[in-house]
Interface confidence: low
Amino acid sequence: DTHKSEVAHRFKDLGEEHFKGLVLVAFSQYLQQCPFEEHVKLVNEVTEFAKTCVADESAENCDKSLHTLFGDKLCTVATLRETYGEMADCCAKQEPERNECFLQHKDDNPNLPPLVRPEVDVMCTAFHDNEATFLKKYLYEVARRHPYFYAPELLFFAARYKAAFAECCQAADKAACLLPKLDELRDEGKASSAKQRLKCASLQKFGDRAFKAWAVARLSQKFPKAEFAEVSKLVTDLTKVHTECCHGDLLECADDRADLAKYMCENQDSISSKLKECCDKPLLEKSHCLAEVENDEMPADLPSLAADYVESKDVCKNYAEAKDVFLGMFLYEYARRHPDYSVMLLLRLAKAYEATLEKCCAAADPHECYAKVFDEFQPLVEEPQNLVKQNCELFEQLGEYKFQNALLVRYTKKVPQVSTPTLVEVSRNLGKVGAKCCKLPEAKRMPCAEDYLSVVLNRLCVLHEKTPVSEKVTKCCTESLVNRRPCFSALELDEAYVPKAFNAETFTFHADMCTLSEKEKQVKKQTALVELVKHKPKATKEQLKGVMDNFAAFVEKCCKADDKEACFAEEGPKFVAASQAALA
C-alpha cells in the first residue's frame, strides 16, 4: 500500500479538519514551550503544502516522509536553542534519529503554568468571536501539557468541548450548564492521558510483546465470544495504532484507528454483541465507544482449562512448537473466563505458567512436574483480592481525604527520597481508587482497582525516570511491568533514609491559605504531611494524626480571625513548636 506522496495520502484519508488538528497536536507535543501563534503558523504552512501534494503528488518534496516534512518544519523555529537547549541538537540529525531525538525530549512534567479557567462570559465571547481559534487553543494547551495524549481521542475531546460551548453559551444559566461539563472533560482527559501514558511506557520500555500480552488479556475479557484468531488480529492492529501514536506518527495512527473501527463494525458478529450501538455513531465517537465498550457475556459452556493446559500430554510439545502462540492462547482462554480479574493479575498468571513450563518441560517427568501448576496460581490471585478488600474497608472507614493521607504516609515512608509534589500528586490519585472502585460489585472491584493503580504508578515511574532519586523506585519501575504494583506494595519503611532536617519555612503559612479552594487547601495540608513524614519517618499514625488535627484547627482559627495574617504570624510558630514536641 505505497503512495507517491504520504502527506497527500493522509490528507485525503483524514480530511482537512482532522489533518490540521492532528498536526497541531503533534507539533504541540514535541515543542511544548512554543507559543500558540507559532504552532498555528507552522500548521498552516504544512496544510498548504499538503494541498499542493494532493493536487500533484509528483510536486517537489511531496515524496518525503512525514517525519522528514514535520521535522524540517519544527527545525525552522528560530528560538529552538534558547527555548529548548539541547533539543536543538536533534535538528543536526537525519531521520529516523531526528524523530527519536524529539521523542526522547518529550517532557512529562513541563514547566507550564496551570490552566486558569476564565469567567464563563469571557469564554463564551471568545468561542463566538472565533470558534476555530478557540478550539485550536484547546488542542494546543492540552497537547503541550500531555505530550503522549492519544491524539485521535484528543480530537474527540475537542468535539465534546465544542458541543459544550455551543449548547451552554445559549443557555439561560451558562455557568450551571457549562462548568459541570468542563469539569467532566478535565477529569476524563486527565484519566485518558494517564492511561495512554501507560500504553506508551509499556511499548517503549518493555517492547511490543508486553503490550500485545496486555491487549490479548484485555480484549479477551471484553470479547469472550470471539475466536483466538479474531482476538489476535485485533491485538496486532491495536498494537500498530498505539505504536504509531506513541512514536509521534499521529496521522498514521488516526488513520489506522479509523480502519480498525471500520473493521470491528463490519465484523461485529465474530467479535461482540455489544458493538452495535457504537457502530451507528460518527467516527470519533465510534472509536471512543469501541475502546470503552463493556465486556460481552461469557459463552455459557466454556470447558475447564485444565484439559488443554495441565492434563494433556502434549503441553510441552505444543509449548515448544510455538511458545508465544501457546502462551497467547492460554492467556486468551484464562482472560475470557475471568472478567473478575485485573489484566495485570492475568499477565502474572501467564508469566507463572510460562515459568513452570520452562522448568518442567526440561524435567525428567514434565507432566508430574506441572500437574499442580494451577494450585500455584492461588497466592497470586489472593494477594490483589486481599489488597482490594483491605483498602476498600479503609476507604469506607476514613473517606477520600483521610484515605489519601493514609496513602501519603505509607508511600512517603516507602520512598522518602521522591519529591514532595510527586508524592502528593501520586498519593492523591492512588486515593481516588476508593471512590472509583470500592462502590462497584465484588466482580468488578479488582479489575477496576488494580488496573487503575497500574496507571497511577506509571505516572510515578515516568516522573521518577526524569529525575531518579530512589533505587527502590527504579527497581520497581524497571524490573517487571506486571509486578510494579506488588513491588510497590511490598516496600517497607526505608531504614537507610536519613531524615530530612526540620525547616520551619516549610511549615510557615499565610492568610492566602484562607482564600484557597477546598482542593488547594487539601494539597497544602498534604504537602505539610509529607514533609512531616520526611522529617520523622518513624512517627506513629497517632502522632501524625494529632499534628494534622492541630494543623486543621490552627488554619480554621486563623481564617476566622479579623486579622488573619497576624494570627498566622503569631499562631504559626506555636503550631510548629507543638508539632516538634509531639513528634520528638
Epitope: 521523542l103 511490543d208 510483546r209
Partner: nanobody
Framework: EVQLVESGGGLVQPGGSLRLSCAAS????????MSWVRQAPGKGPEWVSA????????RYAESVKGRFTISRDNAKKTLYLQMNNLKPEDTAMYYC????????GSQGTQVTVSS
C-alpha cells in the same frame, strides 16, 4: 541485577568487518526492544540501531544503513551488530542498551577503524 556485557570490538582497516555481541542477564531479555548506541571521543552518544523484542522490526541510523545489521538470539539472551564496510567515522565506543535509550549502563566495546 541488570547486566549488559559487550564484546567483539577491535582495530580494523577501512572496508573491513566486525561482529559485536552483547550478553544480557538479570532481566527478561526476550521482552525488551534493544539498541546499539555509540560514542566517539569528545562527542555525545549517538543511537545506531534498534530491534524489537521478537526481532522482526529493525531500525538504523542513516549513517549506517546498508552496512550494519542488528539481530538477536533470545534463547541465548544475546544481541548482535554485524558491521560491514567499516569507515573511519565509525570509530567509537559501542554500547548496547535496553529499549531506545541512549543512556549507557554498560562498559562498552571499542571499535577503531584505521589504516
Amino acid at each position: 541485577e541488570v547486566q549488559l556485557v559487550e564484546s567483539g570490538g577491535g582495530l580494523v582497516q577501512p572496508g573491513g568487518s566486525l561482529r559485536l555481541s552483547c550478553a544480557a542477564s538479570g532481566f527478561t531479555f526476550g521482552s525488551f526492544g534493544m539498541s546499539w548506541v555509540r560514542q566517539a571521543p569528545g562527542k555525545g552518544p549517538e543511537w545506531v540501531s534498534a530491534i524489537d523484542s521478537g526481532g522482526a522490526d529493525t531500525r538504523y541510523a542513516e549513517s549506517v544503513k546498508g552496512r550494519f545489521t542488528i539481530s538477536r538470539d533470545n534463547a541465548k539472551k544475546t544481541l548482535y551488530l554485524q558491521m560491514n564496510n567499516l569507515k573511519p567515522e565509525d570509530t567509537a565506543m559501542y554500547y548496547c542498551t535496553i529499549g531506545r535509550s541512549t543512556s549507557r549502563g554498560s562498559q562498552g566495546t571499542q571499535v577503531t577503524v584505521s589504516s
